[in-house]
Interface confidence: low
Amino acid sequence: ATKAVCVLKGDGPVQGIINFEQKESNGPVKVWGSIKGLTEGLHGFHVHEFGDNTAGCTSAGPHFNPLSRKHGGPKDEERHVGDLRNVTADKDGVADVSIEDSVISLSGDHCIIGRTLVVHEKADDLGKGGNEESTKTGNAGSRLACGVIGIAQ
């Protein structure tokens, strides 16, 4: 199995640790972890194109989208590779992350290793917001915390 890990950090209180595991190169990727310091409710959760955090989370670029598609939800045919889903923070500001995704990969063309994982300020409308921004970012707002996805032992 291939494993990866990402430590999420931002300017504010949001931080987290996210693990990735892929048993077979064409198989699904299991994503699990925890994020704390969030406001209660939904927060967009995406892989962005660049592993560049030199200017904070903004330098990570747009959603990872090697197929040049519109933004969508994780189960949509029309989605960015980096479109995971919303994570839900409870009243303590902690979000449980438990995802299995068959579009991202830890190898090949859809490899997310070396790219940036971002948790956003607001809920991702999953491309259903009815405006142009919805088809790009899901109107998920600012980038609260991010981290480069790296190979784990």
Epitope: S34, K36, T88, V94, S98
Partner: antibody, heavy 117, light 107 residues
Framework: QVQLVQSGAEVKTPGASVKVSCKAS????????ISWVRQAPGQGLEWMGW????????NYAQKFQGRVTMTTDTSTSTAYMELRSLRSDDTAMYYC??????????WGQGTLVTVSS | DIQMTQSPSSVSASVGDRVTITCRAS??????LAWYQHKPGKAPKLLIY???SLQSGVPSRFSGSGSGTDFTLTISSLQPEDFATYYC?????????FGQGTKVEIK
């Protein structure tokens, strides 16, 4: 407030199966996983596995692989844990707990399963 | 599987004492550690998550520290309701595993 309410105590014979239920309320059921933990008499806590309510992904401890099945019913916000081929050393208090990242923040009251011939 | 070793296995203390419980992981678990309090006939209660974050509603006399392989739970001033068994639990990799428990008893 968040609550997990488990089914009542069970007495089973060796070789039988038991199915424990765990009804959740006070939060969005699909946003968190459910873990199952047991404690045998005089022993410590033992993690059995968990299920992601969002997509039914399960991860079982090797010790229980092939003998345990964890399921959920989102229409009733209920999680289930079935343990088959029961042995006397499966006698324990079984707990469900809400999985939140790397911890379990709310727990059911426990279900005592006694395996005896 | 990752082994979690707690010490001591039991401790006798008086009300007002400072109590420290340690937990050692058999390999690096980053900050993936939680602490629970368990009283007979009751469900376990989460005290600390991600090694050092205090669960809401838990008194501030409880604190957690550590990273990597060595972790500590401290009760700064033991109260009568704190006599219980305490468990650490790692979540760095599956299966999640618990320490064997530390029983805090009245001296």
């Amino acid at each position: 407030q968040v609550q997990l309410v488990q089914s009542g105590a069970e007495v089973k014979t060796p070789g039988a199966s038991v199915k424990v239920s765990c009804k959740a309320s006070g939060y969005t059921f699909t946003s968190f996983g459910i873990s199952w933990v047991r404690q045998a008499p005089g022993q410590g806590l033992e993690w059995m596995g968990w299920i992601s309510v969002y997509n039914d992904y399960t991860n079982y401890a090797q010790k229980f692989q092939g003998r345990v099945t964890m399921t959920t019913d989102t229409s009733t916000s209920t999680a289930y844990m079935e343990l088959r081929s029961l042995r006397s050393d499966d006698t324990a208090m079984y707990y469900c707990a809400r999985k939140r990242g790397g911890d379990m923040d709310y727990w059911g009251q426990g279900t005592l399963v006694t395996v005896s011939s | 599987d990752i082994q979690m070793t707690q010490s001591p296995s039991s401790v006798s203390a008086s009300v007002g004492d400072r109590v420290t419980i340690t937990c050692r992981a058999s390999q690096d678990i980053s900050s993936w550690l939680a602490w629970y309090q368990h009283k007979p006939g009751k469900a376990p209660k989460l005290l600390i998550y991600l090694a050092s974050s205090l669960q809401s509603g838990v008194p501030s006399r409880f604190s957690g520290s550590g990273s990597g392989t060595d972790f500590t739970l401290t009760i700064s001033s033991l109260q009568p309701e704190d006599f219980a068994t305490y468990y650490c639990q790692q979540a760095n990799s599956f299966p999640w595993t618990f320490g064997q428990g530390t029983k805090v008893e009245i001296k």
